[in-house]
Amino acid sequence: SDKLYQRKEPVISSVHTKVKGIAEVTENVTEGGVTKLGHSIFDTADYTFPLQGNSFFVMTNYVKSEGQVQTLCPEYPRRGAQCSSDRRCKKGWMDPQSKGIQTGRCVPYDKTRKTCEVSAWCPTEEEKEAPRPALLRSAENFTVLIKNNIHFPGHNYTTRNILPTMNGSCTFHKTWDPQCSIFRLGDIFQEAGENFTEVAVQGGIMGIEIYWDCNLDSWSHHCRPRYSFRRLDDKNMDESFVPGYNFRYAKYYKENNVEKRTLIKAFGIRFDILVFGTGGKF
Amino acid sequence: SDKLYQRKEPVISSVHTKVKGIAEVTENVTEGGVTKLGHSIFDTADYTFPLQGNSFFVMTNYVKSEGQVQTLCPEYPRRGAQCSSDRRCKKGWMDPQSKGIQTGRCVPYDKTRKTCEVSAWCPTEEEKEAPRPALLRSAENFTVLIKNNIHFPGHNYTTRNILPTMNGSCTFHKTWDPQCSIFRLGDIFQEAGENFTEVAVQGGIMGIEIYWDCNLDSWSHHCRPRYSFRRLDDKNMDESFVPGYNFRYAKYYKENNVEKRTLIKAFGIRFDILVFGTGGKF
Amino acid sequence: SDKLYQRKEPVISSVHTKVKGIAEVTENVTEGGVTKLGHSIFDTADYTFPLQGNSFFVMTNYVKSEGQVQTLCPEYPRRGAQCSSDRRCKKGWMDPQSKGIQTGRCVPYDKTRKTCEVSAWCPTEEEKEAPRPALLRSAENFTVLIKNNIHFPGHNYTTRNILPTMNGSCTFHKTWDPQCSIFRLGDIFQEAGENFTEVAVQGGIMGIEIYWDCNLDSWSHHCRPRYSFRRLDDKNMDESFVPGYNFRYAKYYKENNVEKRTLIKAFGIRFDILVFGTGGKF
């Protein structure tokens, strides 16, 4: 609340997060031309990345392009990419949607379709839909511990969101335990009025806002955080503006002296921890 | 503009970036003692890294040290590093410029020069100039989509830089399309009065400032971003303060049961997105 | 100091860090059932990660779980995890402390103990103490160069912490060289009243605060940074809230066509650079 006689100072903040949880993933795996159901376990080292500060990322879905090699191949026949003769293919051209540089030749992609040949990581990534339901949909049950240290340098005051009296096996609840700083990912979404299962498919960005409204006067001292949650990406976004949240990364390796990579298109939730507020003192 | 009757509140911001583009890289490749011209394709998974929030990095140049192994070897004969006898080499000494720990022996580096032997990743990294022109100089034509969600919690107001009416195939232009949030990297440099081709060699840091000056009063509501660009690293910096922008990372692998690594010194542009401004309401 | 007639504006900041140093690590290495002392060298590519912006991480300690494979195995017999019959093991159950999903069977872990079988990366990570003293305790002697570019857009004023007159071989000292921006990690801890050797074991978070109190009036212009240091993690934190600072990451590889990983639990210091202050002008 506004106390006009007070000197207000913005908060200086540092955040540390720790995600916990295991996901069992079931997907079709093709080996030697035979497709069978594969089960695998994902732990924190598999679905999250060592990230700094005010953000953490949890992978909820993925598409893999395995065994890619730098060579020539037909590009993926997405809408408008097919050709019938070399005239349609421009040597040296890089279509922003494509994954390579055109050689100028129109070549067979499969029995019925021809596309422009490209110099690229081959075979080029298929533009297939993200799996539905999401492969790591059980990430809904993961938890994140958020540690927040704050400082008002002008008032020479420091505190943190976790107090010695707190119980490490608590789970945040808006009513029953609003000071607990261990959050179930599904609960964060529920609080924000969003459906985790749905967002997990394409990914998204979720804001965890930590608001410190601190009265540092000794006679009415109060300085505890208030947590709230809101979705930060635009769920109604046009295709051309890349809805959801995903990025590509690669694992490189050598096989029979050939440099190869596995390309992973990782979909997931990026959680941004937005700390704000003021400290007021007479 | 300052409206003194308004209650001003600083912006709370979240940023999401997406880089697009492919680079063709031509460089000398040595295999089995034979040097020939090699062509390779770099896509987003090769030249950028999964990074959080307000920064993204585009690799524009690199120097590789392949097949390094942990063992003993002569250190690189940079200026002042040569020796003529063991007296010049101090067992256990770590020169901050060196890449290893001295054994105390002065050994031949090549036919004419001797340097102190070190325990290190060998052969030690050669201190050679970054390639000129930059290997990924074509990154000038890459584009970045910037999504920015902002919030004034005190005024309970949220908006974003991308509106439903926007066209996903636009490119930012200061005059013709100042609200488009897809930026060509070369244009960012041009706007900042910098030469992309030059900066790409050693790397640098470029600021993309997003200024929100929001009037949230219903009778004169205005809340759209203004983009500006400025270089953040010091181009006139003394050698000793490490000009440009680069970092080293390694790819580890096993060959014939020996742990090896390829060390990559990656030069590039780090783009910092600096969001600021206020929301005022009566 | 407060000049009430001035228009104050918060600082917009960009940070770039560069860590230097080499560590020699001595640890027990087991190969083919034989344990012997192994020496290895860690340079920046081994102990730090390409990180953005206002944070950097230095690994000071680690625990490795090598050659893990996705299969079935007994879980680690931590306190309360042992079983005597299948009744104690619940098919499909994921204990947050465990590293896998229970199959429902109680199986031998070793000669004397039985635990629930899990589907996991096997053998599961042993819950052993972080090595003491820390493996990279010599990181105390590493240095970090901090470059900070600041901007007061409203006053159209930009400056940086490194001036052309500065000497690149300086080391920060509170009294003798308070403007030098090259910091020895051990000195940062000493200034903050903390023991590097101790914190290096479990890891921690250290704040480097850069305070700009800028008077931009031409007649009494002053705008230089003031550095201070404080520990940000809670050293008295309860076990359940994960004291220190660590994260897990994995290196994946294939051996005899089997997908394997080495899991590294990395302990270290995350340094957060907290830039704040105001620019005032009449």
Partner: nanobody
């Protein structure tokens, strides 16, 4: 699924030559040859992209074997010369999406090189 039929295998003396041919039931970007020697894994021999661009050979056959294609007929040939006893194997024709990636294989044809 692409049907592949190989021909041209047989017995030949060391130093001799042999030409293998393969016909595919439909057009495909890349065609190539693999082989499996007794008690060994299947290994790549040679591959050709559309119109014979690019071509790729295993180190062990470079300079001795030549791959050629006829796009119009959906065929690929492997001209083998300077044959050695270690070239003895079943040779399989394959088709795929690049000279490194193959999805379909024929039944194979036996090549035996006697010393």
């Amino acid at each position: 699924e692409v049907q592949l039929v190989e021909s041209g295998g047989g017995l030949v003396q060391a130093g001799g030559s042999l030409r293998l041919s393969c016909a595919a039931s439909e057009r495909t970007y890349s065609m190539g040859w693999f082989r499996r020697a007794p008690g060994k894994e299947r290994e790549f021999v040679a591959g050709s992209g559309w119109d014979g661009i690019p071509t790729r050979y295993a180190d062990s056959v470079k300079g001795r074997f030549t791959i050629s294609r006829d796009n119009a007929k959906n065929t690929v040939s492997l001209q083998m010369s300077g044959l050695k006893p270690e070239d003895t194997a079943i040779y399989y024709c394959a088709t795929g999406t690049s000279v490194y990636h193959y999805q379909y294989w024929g039944q194979g044809t036996q090549v035996t090189v006697s010393s």
